[in-house]
Interface confidence: medium
Amino acid sequence: GIATINCSGNMWVEPGEIFQMGMNVSVYCQEALKNCRPRNLHFYKNGFKERFHITRINRTTARVWYKGFSEPHASMYCTAECPGRFQETLICGKDISSGYPPDAPSNMTCVIYEYSGNMTCTWNTGKPTYIDTKYTVHVKSLETEEQQQYLASNYVNISTDSLQGGRKYLVWVQAVNALGMENSQQLQVHLDDIVIPSPSIISRAETTNANVPKTIIYWKSKIMTGKVFCEMRYKATTNQTWNVKEFDTNYTYVQQSEFYLEPNSKYVFQVRCQGTGKRNWQPWSSPFVHQTPQTASQVTSKPPHEPQKIEMLTATIFKGHSTSDNSQDIG
């Protein structure tokens, strides 16, 4: 490559080998060849000889000028025409790059997906820089003032094992390249508040043989501590609208929820929970489908090995009400 050229002279770039895209650029070549008084000095960009805007400054030096250089990367080299030599003689080469200083990273968010063991932070890097840009995530404990740094691209996974300095942190990103440096706004995170809980699981359903058939859904929330608020939504697969049942209790064991459903119908159930005082809901559990019997006989459903792909309509829930819309949300 260009970087390994053994130069017989010098090549330099003004304003520099890395510069802002759209700038005017001059590339200089100065020969220091033995036994050669060059007739001409030639410039090549990405292997193609330049024909225009070349100026011979003196016996040993020439310049090529580019107006509004807009290529992210280019390989430049220059050669000399030596009298009596059939081939041009290589003088020197340089890789040049153009781009932009980084934007201040924006829209930073950090979450802990339950049981992942990581705090995952993402951000918007802004417009492309076209040049090598490093992102450093700074994490400062507000309880101990300890600060840690992590090198990243456009996201970072930080082991929760390393977050030993308490619950509250300031997190920000610094973007740096050869053309500039920008910091994001500082994000204050409370680890309790950014946990995205794992979904609950509906394990089975059964409809009992009775005068009024009753369907029991067996399910378990993975939220194990404190009080939990849960919602179970269900609907016939032929319906657009979800019905929602709400639960508010202390769950550490398998729950049983009872429903009185139409016979000979296919229903889909989903459940989600939220720890009391916690910001984030679990995602809706995988859809669980149960077929009610035609007549009074017992039917049991178990979850399939493969998740069932069922298009469902989400519900906007108010206590005691249900309305449907046309977006998909199957958890």
Epitope: T144, E146, L163, Q164, D192
Partner: antibody, heavy 122, light 106 residues
Amino acid sequence: QIQLVQSGPELKKPGETVKISCKASGYTFTTYGMSWVKQAPGKGLKWMGWINTYSGVPTYADDFKGRFAFSLETSASTAYLQINNLKNEDTATYYCARRDRYGYVAGAFAYWGQGTLVTVSS
Amino acid sequence: QIVLTQSPAIMSASPGEKVTMTCSASSSVSYMYWYQQKPGSSPRLLIYDTSNLASGVPVRFSGSGSGTSYSLTISRMEAEDAATYYCQQWSSYPWTFGGGTKLEIK
């Protein structure tokens, strides 16, 4: 079960150095920070600072900057407290203590070593 | 730094009696933690996050409070509860303990 076992009592002269160990067992050592707490005879508890066992970075409370040093031997699941240039007022029981996690964050000191009595006397 | 002031410094109670001790913070804190220490022993965690009982702690212990005022209550004093009790905060660096309340049995 989780245990923090500290080294035995020490009798030192002023100006000497002491190094106390705290060996952890029953959990992954690098998952929880280790704090050190001082208790002078007949007095209350004073938090000295802590060391992040994942990164090895120590943090010292203001009163314990200078002569005090926290360190780790991760392969041995052991944390150390070293006190240099001992003074009479360093006479105390020193505890290592590990925070627990409630949910996904570090909480209170749920686990304590048995304490190491350091006596400084000429 | 946040100073935690415990009161009373020393108190005594008869078996079966209700006991309340307080911890006052010089600035508002988010959570309070309580420890029990008996002579010759290491401290033991009683209450975390202001009101949650640590593992193995009898239900006669309870914690409450918010802002700058917190309390620890023993609903019915037992002989084994004679000890020194410390409050502690994590909300602001450096972490600090209160001076302790020594609870004696009558």
